[in-house]
């Protein structure tokens, strides 16, 4: 699979999730999470070859298509498979408050 | 949607599903399908600037800091999101067979 | 600059439901809140509720709680304030501010306003 | 819920001179949880001072904020004709966000 187990121990050059740190103040503009002040979101990059963790029988169809048409602007994209939440703190006035944020983590990437 | 509908009748620069044909011997060299020759498969492609039909928390997250970071290469990508089947006619010998080839085609696309 | 434009007067009758809408432009949507409050004819402002648009989360002030609705739409960057079972004493005019930030805050940026009247 | 009462309910001064328009809370608030806004008729209200002390972008500086705990004040060092309005104070320390009745600023 391509996760974080395998992408951050190794070099792989085709589509795998990568590292990116979000600062929520700085790189969103949100001013209402407290905690954290930010978040490794990760991101998912590189090019999908046949046979690359393809997602769908299209996904397989368009990098054969791809392979056989190296100009086309027609190719799978890396993009996230696992998503997971993030759990952060806000303040309602003086009080805070836990709440979890679904689909915030990237786990592992596929090419669709 | 970013469906067949919208973005076949219009000329939108942002993510959506775009048109493409395959021919399955020249573009595939698939040669055990009998009917049809081709098919249009389609394609996704475009930007996906903020608020353009996100997929997921995430990917709005990912917009909103590929708004505030616009060289940054983490960036929501076009990709399907409906996909229909194609019946397709391939023999056996002199026995032709009918088969449905699931997620052939693509009918609308997201930004994940 | 920053712009919230809301929907126009409306005129209803005792027990049924509002809908105002207020549409922000000039800024990132989602990285803002969104408050509500209202203000009876020569009366003043009272506090209804706001929401986070990005992640959808809405909070009410007590009184409010079960009648009122506060949702985002962020494909047209716009917040929708539904208030039901109306009654004569929620003729007033209606108002979204954007606050500073936080979710409650001071409000920064307001709507024009959008004069509800529940008459019979 | 937190009340804010404000005071004087009426303010009758002439162009020119200082206003003084005090807000005090039923329980303490901190040092920056409350905010001040002008209202004209027939308009939204503008924010002036938010944090207590903290002027909003494009106030004039003849508005300053003061206090902290449970009693804060608006100060116009210098009125203009433009300045005869309503203002209100808002806490935002706890839920509900409450504001004050009001002071009307109006002209001697």
């Known amino acids: 699979a391509l996760d974080t187990n395998y992408c951050f121990s190794s070099t792989e050059k085709n589509c795998c999730v990568r590292q990116l740190y979000i600062d929520f103040r700085k790189d969103l503009g949100w001013k209402w999470i407290h905690e954290p002040k930010g978040y490794h979101a990760n991101f998912c990059l590189g090019p999908c070859p046949y046979i690359w963790s393809l997602d769908t029988q299209y996904s397989k169809v368009l990098a054969l298509y791809n392979q056989h048409n190296p100009g086309a602007s027609a190719a799978p994209c890396c993009v996230p498979q696992a998503l997971e939440p993030l759990p952060i703190v806000y303040y309602v006035g003086r009080k805070p408050k836990v709440e979890q944020l679904s689909n915030m983590i990237v786990r592992s990437c596929k090419c669709s | 949607a970013l469906d067949t509908n919208y973005c076949f009748s219009s000329t939108e620069k942002n993510c959506c599903v775009r048109q493409l044909y395959i021919d399955f011997r020249k573009d595939l060299g698939w040669k055990w399908i009998h009917e049809p020759k081709g098919y249009h498969a389609n394609f996704c492609l475009g930007p996906c600037p903020y608020i353009w039909s996100l997929d997921t928390q995430y990917s709005k997250v990912l917009a909103l800091y590929n708004q505030h970071n616009p060289g940054a290469s983490a960036a929501p990508c076009c990709v399907p999101q409906a996909l229909e089947p194609l019946p397709i006619v391939y023999y056996v010998g002199r026995k032709p067979k009918v088969e449905q080839l699931s997620n052939m085609i693509v009918r609308s696309c997201k930004c994940s | 600059q920053v712009q919230l434009v809301q929907s126009g007067a409306e005129v209803k009758k005792p027990g049924s439901s509002v809908k105002v809408s207020c549409k922000a432009s000039?800024?990132?949507?989602?990285?803002?809140?969104i408050s509500w409050v209202r203000q009876a004819p020569g009366q003043g402002l009272e506090w209804m509720g706001g929401v986070i648009p990005i992640v959808d989360i809405a909070y009410y002030a007590q009184r409010f709680k079960g009648r009122v609705t506060i949702t985002a739409d962020e494909s047209t960057s716009t917040t929708y304030m539904e208030l039901s079972s109306l009654r004569s004493e929620d003729t007033a005019v209606y108002y979204c501010?954007?606050?500073?930030?936080?979710?409650?805050?001071?409000?920064?940026?307001w709507g024009q306003g959008t004069l509800v009247t529940v008459s019979s | 819920e937190t009340v804010l009462t404000q005071s004087p309910g009426t303010l009758s001064l002439s162009p020119g001179e200082r206003a003084t328009l005090s807000c005090r809370a039923s329980q303490s608030l901190g040092s920056s949880y409350l905010a001040w806004y002008q209202q004209k008729p027939g308009q939204a209200p503008r924010l002036l001072i938010y944090?207590?002390?903290s002027r909003a972008p494009g106030i004039p500086d003849r508005f300053s904020g003061s206090g902290s705990g449970t009693d804060f004040t608006l100060t116009i060092s210098r009125l203009e004709p433009e300045d005869f309005a309503v203002y209100y104070c808002?806490?935002?320390?706890?839920?509900?966000?409450?504001f004050g009745q009001g002071t009307r600023l109006e002209i001697k």
């Open positions: 944090g207590a002390s």
């Open positions: 000039g800024y990132t949507f989602s990285s803002n809140v």
């Open positions: 501010a954007s606050t500073l930030g936080l979710v409650l805050d001071a409000m920064d940026y």
């Open positions: 808002q806490q935002y320390a706890d839920s509900p966000i409450t």
